[in-house]
Interface confidence: medium
């Protein structure tokens, strides 16, 4: 049970960090050429 809880926590942490990064990547792109390949 303890092991399961730890695994779930790790997965949540990873998901959260990925989401934060993804949002910040998209956020930054908005301030620049927003379709990098469409020139």
């Amino acid at each position: 049970k303890h092991k399961c809880f730890r695994k779930e926590l790790e997965e949540n942490e990873t998901l959260e960090s990925i989401m934060n990064t993804a949002e910040s990547e998209e956020e930054l792109k908005k301030y620049f050429y927003y379709l990098e390949g469409s020139k």
Partner: antibody
Framework: QVQVVESGGGVVQPGRSLRLSCAAS????????MHWVRQAPGKGLEWVTV????????NYADSVKGRFTISRDNSKNTLYLQMNSLRAEDTAMYYC???????????WGQGTMVTVSS | DIVMTQTPLSSPVTLGQPASISCRSS???????????LSWLQQRPGQPPRLLIY???NRFSGVPDRFSGSGAGTDFTLKISRVEADDVGVYYC?????????FGPGTKVDIK
């Protein structure tokens, strides 16, 4: 050709306001984030503010937060910088720059000079 | 804020000889997308800045191949293989990895 042209600079007293404009041509203005960068006389470059391509996102340097407002009118291909509560330390050449591919400032205007003095 | 430092701050060079400018950031400029958003700008006397290099080593259109950029992480270099009279001015490195975007103090290149 691809260019941006700033206007609206001048001499203004401390505490007063000024609005700068940047007219863009030669590219699809609504596809690009746009920036203001300033340079005090004899000094280096300082990033001031940015607005996203659609105007929905803005970010400011701490030194101007709460005093300066960036905006854009994509129908007029024009970028603006509303500067309120001006201080002597805001005296600088103000450049408009396009945010280009590779997150770099790829097109710069000639600048417009703002002097804050009593 | 990410602090950018440059060395040297002044560089007297001989025409036809190489020149090198170093730029260091206070933290890594690598973003999670794997890219490093470090650019180099040239400002000739009385002129606005002009983009030379973006993403460490990519030359912007119209920039002569005498200019090259290299580096990784926190340490970057701009090299001019053979300095010409036209190259006189101030060179700035700049990071666009994280808000607020920041510039180096600039390196003044002039002819000996």
């Amino acid at each position: 050709q691809v260019q941006v042209v700033e206007s609206g600079g001048g001499v203004v007293q401390p505490g007063r306001s000024l609005r700068l404009s940047c007219a863009a041509s030669g590219f699809t203005f609504s596809n690009y984030g746009m920036h203001w960068v300033r340079q005090a006389p004899g000094k280096g470059l300082e990033w001031v503010t940015v607005i996203s391509y659609d105007g929905s996102n803005k970010n400011y340097a701490d030194s101007v937060k709460g005093r300066f407002t960036i905006s854009r009118d994509n129908s007029k291909n024009t970028l603006y910088l509303q500067m309120n509560s001006l201080r002597a330390e805001d005296t600088a050449m103000y450049y408009c720059a396009r945010g280009g591919s590779g997150f770099a400032f790829d097109i710069w205007g000639q600048g417009t000079m703002v002097t804050v003095s009593s | 804020d990410i602090v950018m430092t440059q060395t040297p701050l002044s560089s007297p060079v001989t025409l036809g000889q190489p020149a090198s400018i170093s730029c260091r950031s206070s933290q890594s400029l690598v973003r999670s997308d794997g890219n490093t958003y470090l650019s180099w700008l040239q400002q000739r006397p009385g002129q606005p800045p002009r983009l030379l290099i973006y993403k460490i080593s990519n030359r912007f259109s119209g920039v002569p191949d005498r200019f090259s950029g290299s580096g990784a992480g926190t340490d970057f270099t701009l090299k001019i293989s053979r300095v010409e009279a036209d190259d006189v001015g101030v060179y700035y490195c700049m990071q666009t990895t994280q808000f607020p975007f920041t510039f180096g103090p600039g390196t003044k290149v002039d002819i000996k």
